[in-house]
Structures are given as C-alpha cells and as structure tokens.
Amino acid sequence: TLNSVLINSNAIKNLPPPLGGAGGQPGSAVSVAPGVLYEGGNKYQTLDNYQPYPCAEDEECGSDEYCSSPSRGAAGVGGVQICLACRKRRKRCMRHAMCCPGNYCKNGICMPSDHSHFPRGEIEESIIENLGNDHNAAAGDGYPRRTTLTSKIYHTKGQEGSVCLRSSDCAAGLCCARHFWSKICKPVLKEGQVCTKHKRKGSHGLEIFQRCYCGEGLACRIQKDHHQASNSSRLHTCQRH
C-alpha cells in the first residue's frame, strides 16, 4: 500500500520549516520536501536529529509538551511558537497543558492531579503574572484567523473533513489534525481506538496523517492483552483512567 507514512499518531504535530529541495526516494509514490516520514524500499525514512516543531496550539504537540514561544536562548525565529517540554510539578504555568501528564495548573503552579480531566489548552484563570518568555503562551495567540472566507465559516464549526487552523475551528468531538498538506477536523479518539504513545522526545512529529488525541476521561495506554515480540511496537489504545 502507498499509505506509506506513519498514520497511527495521536500526537498532533507540525513539521519543521523547509530545509531544502524535494527529497524523494526511488520507489516512493510522492516526493515530500523535506523531512516527512514516508516509505521508500519498505523502510521508514526520517530525520535523525531532533528539531523543534512549529505549532499553533497545544494539541499539535506531544503529551509531554506544550505550545509556546521559545526562550530567548532557544533556537527559533522570533514570534514563532514551538512545542516545548512540559513543566514538572511546582513549576510555574498558565494553563493545564503546560504541566506534565499527571499534573494540572493551579494558582500558576503545576500540581499533582489524580485525574487528567482538564481539556488541553484551557487557561488557568487565577494566574495573573506573566511567565517571563511565555508571553504568547495562551493557545492560538497571534495566529491568523479566518476572516476573509465565506459567511459559512463565521457561523459554523467545521465538520469532519473541514479544513481547520486549530481545534477550536472544529465542532464538538473533533480536533484539528494534519492530513497530508492541510489540517482537517477529525474525530477525537474513543475508548478502544488505537492511539500512539511517544516514548522519546523527537520520535514523533513527522507524521503527515495524524490521529486526534484520546477523548475526555481516556488515556493512551498499552493494551493489556496485546502481546508482541517488540516492546516498542506494542499496541496502545484509548482506555478509561
């Protein structure tokens, strides 16, 4: 099959900016330039080095990351937001997504939580201080919004298959996920559906066909009855907390 990119990702992530010309492989169905994970000769080709990924909202980042402007010392163009490592407990935060899994943002500090019941991107209301370099931390800040299209876009949330810029463009039960050259509204994963748990930083983000995250009250975990030779390829599904 020529559906030769990694498609079972629930980490909705963008690609790095272009690095050069088209980089095809003999036998590949399409040339994607550059750095896109695709199959050539039955082997996945990918970037070896970890690079920051641009993002417009937290949902485009992995479960252990959030979307924000990089610090002054970090690589990146001014004004561009990238996926940053989540903040551990007792670190400062502005919203729940900034805190690492198992924590949530309370009074501007990441605190341990028994239940990850807060939607990603929700802004912690009690925070009043500006978090240093995280001046653009609120999801979606400073990003272009649809203002010049037909009236349909002003009044209706995107349905399945509608183009989106961020998940707030989509109707309830849908998220904004990449599908090849666009981002479209796709269904949030339900209990029992396959998801992907990314173990290493930089091991995700190159998917060009992406799944949504698991729905509310669900977590992406190893399927208990799924036995495979390789630990790294064990099936993950959305399961109740």
Epitope: N3, S4, P17, P18, A29, P144, T150
Partner: antibody, heavy 120, light 111 residues
Framework: EVQLVESGGGLVQPGGSLRLSCAAS????????ISWVRQAPGKGLEWVAS??????????YYPDSVKGRFTISRDNAKNSLYLQMNSLRAEDTAVYYC???????????WGQGTTVTVSS | EIVLTQSPATLSLSPGERATLSCRAS??????????INWYQQKPGQAPRLLIY???KQGSGIPARFSGSGSGTDFTLTISSLEPEDFAVYYC?????????FGGGTKVEIK
C-alpha cells in the same frame, strides 16, 4: 470573494522551461495549502504539486511523474503561487489549474486555468 | 496508488430524471472515521467545481439535489432530478493517500 487567476502558459519546445503563476485574493493566502492540478486535452484530472500553509511549514509535495522537473513555490507577500516547469515533455501538455483547500479537504476553489503546449 | 474506477463512462438521461454515478476504489479510502472521497463537476471550457467532500458532505452553495453516499471502496453520487445545467462530466477523487488520484470521469449527457 475568493479568486485564483493563473498565467504564464504558452507554447514551448520539448526540453524547455516555463513558469506558471497564480494570483490569489479573497482569503488569508499564507494560511492555506494550495496546489496545481492539470488536465491533458480530452483527458481527466491529475494532481501536479502542492504546498502547505504557514501552520505546516510550507512543505512541498510532488508525484513521481513531475518530481525533479517541477518546483512549486509561493510568495506570501504577493499572494502568489508559482510552478517552475523544467525539462518539459509532450505529455506535460495540459491546462494547468491552481486550486486551494480553504473550507474542505478537497480542491474547493479553482482558477480558470492556463494552457501549456509542449511541441516541436 | 489508489485507482478510482468510475462507471458508467457515459450516462444518457433526460432532464428531471435521477442520475446515479458510481466510483469504486482499488482499496478502502476510509480512515480516521472519514471517507476521503470528493466529487467534482466540470463543464466544457471550465474549471472543476467541488460538489461533495468527505464522501457525503455538500460543498458551499451546492444544490440539495446533489448527494454523496458510500464507504470503504464503493461510492455513489446521486443527482435526484437532473436540471439542464447538470449535464457535464463528473469526477471522483481520493485524498486518503498520496498521491491524490482522480477517477476517469462520467459524462452525463442529454438523452
């Protein structure tokens, strides 16, 4: 109103080059993917190239049939899309359309097309 | 690549009749809970026009007489009652996999 206007088509000899342009208006050009689709005389539609929008890093995409010969690019300041076509062949003769995906994951807005004829 | 086969190649009907156009994919075009099939209408000398996306959803400004159905590999475009302006060529397209592909088209002509 969304508008896409192609230009730059014409007659060129095999092995020659041509650069097509597509002027866009009526939408936030940089935010959205935009593509080239062609149609040979009396034939069906064929996807030629695409470039993603700002949120996806302006990635470019090609089918094997044009890879290495055609280059898609965009100038967001000018709201313009381009297709640089090199090493042209007789089978590249077609009407070339630029099309974009603004509302739906499909080519929901199209230009009127520009004709490219490759012949000696 | 995914091959789309449209049938019939030509459909001869009269205004007011119901048109049923078929598009069959060489493999499933469903993924992520979405059918990645689109339908376009093209008239001579004009650019294609999007009718249906995601298998069954109507594009902007498309009359209700146009509807799409199907899943997996078999899809149908139905025009409930043909209007004079509906006589044209219709193409299906898949956007599930790369490269995107189009069917060969069905010409709907006046009987």
């Amino acid at each position: 109103e969304v508008q896409l206007v192609e230009s730059g088509g014409g007659l060129v000899q095999p092995g020659g080059s041509l650069r097509l342009s597509c002027a866009a208006s009526g939408f936030t050009f940089s935010s959205y993917a935009i593509s080239w689709v062609r149609q040979a005389p009396g034939k069906g539609l064929e996807w030629v190239a695409s470039v993603s929008g700002t949120g996806l890093g302006f990635q470019t995409y090609y089918p094997d049939s044009v890879k290495g010969r055609f280059t898609i690019s965009r100038d967001n300041a000018k709201n313009s899309l381009y297709l640089q076509m090199n090493s042209l062949r007789a089978e590249d003769t077609a009407v070339y359309y630029c099309a974009t995906s603004l509302e739906n994951y499909a080519f929901d807005y199209w230009g009127q097309g520009t004709t490219v004829t490759v012949s000696s | 690549e995914i091959v789309l086969t449209q049938s019939p190649a030509t459909l001869s009907l009269s205004p007011g009749e119901r048109a049923t156009l078929s598009c069959r994919a060489s493999e499933s075009v469903d993924d992520f809970g979405i059918s990645f099939i689109n339908w376009y209408q093209q008239k001579p000398g004009q650019a294609p026009r999007l009718l249906i996306y995601a298998g069954s959803k109507q594009g902007s400004g498309i009359p209700a007489r146009f509807s799409g159905s199907g899943s997996g590999t078999d899809f149908t475009l139905t025009i409930s009652s043909l209007e004079p302006e509906d006589f044209a060529v219709y193409y299906c397209q898949q956007l599930k996999e790369v490269p995107p592909t189009f069917g060969g088209g069905t010409k709907v002509e006046i009987k």
